[in-house]
């Protein structure tokens, strides 16, 4: 987690002055609690946005939007601590807009946005924004929460953004699958523009199971320039084995810039339909 | 512009199914993330489900989790709610909602919702 571009953050607007600042997401009115604290903020909206860092490159960011309630504890309002947790590595990130003059109620509703949070693609997000200062152990809470899940890079939008390039996401190998006689797959997929080595993952399955039935990697070794864009294609022997007839096909990457970490690919053939052939019926019947 | 219509309402006895769309146009339906909400009478406007742009994340109100389902299908630009094992409960007007912003959020909108003041009339009763 981190912010993009770390250059002034401005959180002041007219009627208020107000300056961002890092946060260890341990407000002092934790540990020094007030009497009087502020309402929680009202209507949090967060959407997905990209932004370019200055040299250029685009990234997702969370944007981040709240109101204020129109009560008077706006009076005792001295900022705001924003965090964002990511779920899957528990990893938070917090900065604190403090307010360096006094709210006034005025003719419009406070509003106040962030949008400087880099996200990355497919992470959910818990996405805090807490007024300060932060209320007495038992009141009211005065803080609203969401999660929030960014898109992968299959996404539309997300696949140009810096992070998604980076893995591979302009790459479309169009795979085709098809099967041949005498237990054989044929893998048919475009190569990249990159003189990188590629690998096929085959992994077979029973119809209708999930436990592989057989496993077997293919190494394509780096295509020269005049390769690129064209099609490759390899032929995979499959085991004979009756009923391991749902075939996933991956294929793996290593472009420099993702090395072991790039998106991967995949296609799937299905178990041939079995036809509804009825029982035949005997002429005669045993009578032993 | 954003277009939102909504069918497959109707009165149904209570334990029975029915199963609602939604086809959208004036936007890139594959892009957003959709929602199912609804109003009984005389109440407020209640989130029933949520399904992320690619289906890989659905969420459920707890009143409905294990009844209902929600599916999309991006080719065709439609939403849809499967509900089964109806209760006179669910009778309300069922409205199909997009998000205003990318992302998606559990249990409920992340931003504002875009939806059509017409919805779909789904009556439970004996």
């Known amino acids: 987690l981190r912010l993009l571009d770390h250059r002034a953050l401005v959180c002041s607007q007219p009627g208020l002055n107000c300056t961002v600042k890092n946060s260890t997401c341990l407000d002092d009115s934790w540990i020094h609690p007030r009497n009087l604290t502020p309402s929680s903020p009202k209507d949090l909206q967060i959407q997905l946005h990209f932004a370019h860092t200055q040299q250029g490159d685009l990234f997702p960011v969370a944007h981040i939007e709240w109101t204020l309630q129109t009560d008077a504890s706006i009076l005792y309002l001295e900022g705001a601590e924003l965090s964002v947790l990511q779920l899957n590595t528990n990893e938070r990130l917090c900065v604190r807009f403090e307010f360096l003059s006094k709210l006034r109620h005025h003719h419009r509703r406070w509003r106040f946005t962030f949008s400087h949070f880099v996200v990355d693609p497919d992470q959910e997000y818990e996405v805090t924004v807490h007024h300060l200062p932060k209320p007495i152990p038992d009141g009211d809470p005065n803080h609203q929460s969401k999660n929030f899940l960014v898109p992968d890079c299959e996404h539309a939008r997300m696949k140009v953004t810096t992070p998604c390039m980076s893995s591979g996401s302009l790459w479309d190998p169009n795979i085709t699958v098809e099967t041949l006689e005498a237990h054989q797959l044929r893998v048919s997929f475009t190569l990249w523009n990159e003189s990188t080595h590629y690998q096929i993952l085959l992994t077979s399955f029973p119809h209708m199971e999930n436990h592989s039935c057989f496993e077997h990697m293919h190494h394509i070794p780096a295509p020269r320039p005049e390769e690129f864009h064209q099609r490759s294609n390899v032929t995979l022997t499959l085991r004979n084995l009756k009923g391991c007839c749902r075939h996933q096909v991956q294929i793996q990457p290593f472009f420099s810039s993702c090395l072991n970490d790039c998106l991967r690919h995949s296609a799937t053939v299905s178990c041939p339909e079995m036809p509804d052939t009825p029982e035949p019926i005997p002429d005669y019947m045993p009578l032993w | 512009e954003v277009q939102l219509v909504e069918s497959g309402g109707g009165l149904v006895q209570p334990g029975r199914s029915l199963r609602l769309s939604c086809a959208a146009s004036g936007f890139t339906f594959a892009d957003y993330a959709l929602h199912w909400v609804r109003q009984a009478p005389g109440k407020g406007l209640e989130w029933v489900s949520g399904?992320?742009?690619?289906?890989?994340?659905?969420d459920y109100a707890d009143t409905v989790k294990g009844r209902f389902t929600i599916s999309r299908d991006n080719a065709k630009n439609s939403l849809y709610l499967q509900m089964n094992s109806l209760r006179a409960e669910d009778t309300a007007l069922y409205y199909c909602?997009?998000?205003k912003g990318l992302g998606y959020c559990r249990g409920g909108s992340c931003s504002y919702f875009d939806y059509r003041v017409q919805g779909t009339l789904v009556t439970v009763s004996s």
């Open positions: 399904i992320s742009w690619n289906a890989g994340r659905k």
């Open positions: 909602a997009k998000e």
